[in-house]
């Protein structure tokens, strides 16, 4: 008799998920000598244990605590780059500016980046057919709870000046419902963080507007100021030139505004 299976609205677990997580972990520990002590098999077992045999709409931050413990990592707290809706450029930036870190430059972020996963209640199977969608099904799903957990911890660790890259091409440059807007902003510690500096990335070549005056940026400024953290904002009019100047700061064209 075929067993009834819940059909969720979201895509299923990424194919070859266990092997992918293990492979990423091994690669990360090879590249980062300070994480050589990490046992990737234990990391996978803890990752799997967070969601296997559990209802995929009933996952808690507590489920991920064994994984969080194994993935504990110290990054320079004053070198943190947050981002919202502009992941690729943020990652390109930290690949050049090697002393700055996005969440996906940490072990746990690197393991899960762009992956989907879920299990089923009372079976040890991974569900490769479908997983819950945050909007259509439930918010307490394995992927969403994972990112909420690691994002909160990442923001809590930040100090001094924290940078955030925001997408100036979107209707809501700052979105209260994004992970940045709903989790990270509220978990920056005012006793440690002096300033949040927003970098608003322009999309159009001829876009010379001051997007730091956008109403959603003003909303972000208000939220941050109420938390006793200073706020500053910069327009990045030419993201291509911005990256080029990070690579070659001595270039003569890098003295002008970018």
């Amino acid at each position: 008799v075929p067993r009834w299976r819940q059909q969720w609205s979201g895509p299923g677990t990424t194919k070859r998920f266990p092997e992918t997580v293990l492979a990423r972990c091994v690669k990360y520990t090879e590249i980062h000598p300070e994480m050589r002590h990490v046992d990737c098999q234990s990391v996978w077992d803890a990752f799997k244990g967070a969601f296997i045999s559990k209802h995929p709409c009933n996952i808690t931050e507590e489920d991920y605590q064994p994984l969080m413990k194994l993935g504990t990592q110290t990054v320079p707290c004053n070198k943190i780059l947050l981002w919202s809706r502009i992941k690729d450029l943020a990652h390109q930036f930290t690949q050049v500016q090697r002393d700055m870190f996005t969440l996906e430059d940490t072990l746990l972020g690197y393991l899960a980046d762009d992956l989907t996963w879920c299990g089923e209640f009372n079976t040890s199977k991974i569900n490769y057919q479908s997983c819950p969608d945050w909007r259509k099904d439930c918010s307490n799903n394995p992927v969403s709870v994972f990112w909420k957990t690691v994002s909160r911890r990442f923001a809590e660790a930040a100090c001094d000046v924290v940078h955030v890259m925001l997408n100036g091409s979107r209707s809501k440059i700052f979105d209260k419902n994004s992970t940045f807007g709903s989790v990270e902003v509220h978990n920056l510690q005012p006793e440690k963080v002096q300033t949040l500096e927003a970098w608003v990335i322009h999309g159009g070549r001829e876009d010379s507007r001051d997007l730091c005056q956008d109403p959603t940026i003003k909303e972000l400024e208000s939220i941050i100021s109420k938390r006793n953290i200073q706020f500053s904002c910069k327009n990045i009019y030419r993201p291509d030139k911005f990256l080029q100047c990070v690579k070659n700061p001595e270039d003569s064209s890098c003295t002008s505004e970018i």
Epitope: P18, E19, V26, T29, E30, R36, H37, D39, C40, Q41
Partner: nanobody, 122 residues
């Protein structure tokens, strides 16, 4: 270049013991899980046992549980397999392998050595 060189195989009587060793080089040893797989005459490859990078986790196929012990020394880059209470059906070429790890009884292998023959016969 990754190199895995097995040693310790040979002829042993049923009920006897052997210890297989593997000299590993060319990769960050402690980052990788290590495993032993075997191939009996005329049969396919069978995964036997694996050990995680730190040595904290081990896994065994049911047929060798309680008889075989896998271990590793990360200072010497050597995974070993202590085989006790050997039986005729343990006769096989035993290969040392490095890999990413395992999920259940699925072993994710990257490299494998040339093998060492273990013959269990009276």
């Amino acid at each position: 270049e990754v190199q895995l060189l097995e040693s310790g195989g040979g002829l042993v009587q049923p009920g006897g013991s052997l210890r297989l060793s593997c000299a590993a080089s060319g990769f960050t040893f402690s980052s990788y899980a290590m495993s032993w797989v075997r191939q009996a005459p005329g049969k396919g490859l069978e995964w036997v046992s694996a050990i995680s990078g730190s040595g904290g986790s081990t896994n065994y196929v049911d047929s060798v549980k309680g008889r075989f012990i896998i271990s590793r020394d990360n200072s010497k880059n050597t995974p070993d397999l202590q085989m006790n209470s050997l039986r005729a059906d343990d006769t096989a070429v035993y290969y040392c392998a490095s890999g990413k790890g395992w999920d259940g009884n699925t072993w994710y292998e990257d490299y494998r050595g040339q093998g060492t023959l273990v013959t269990v016969s009276s």
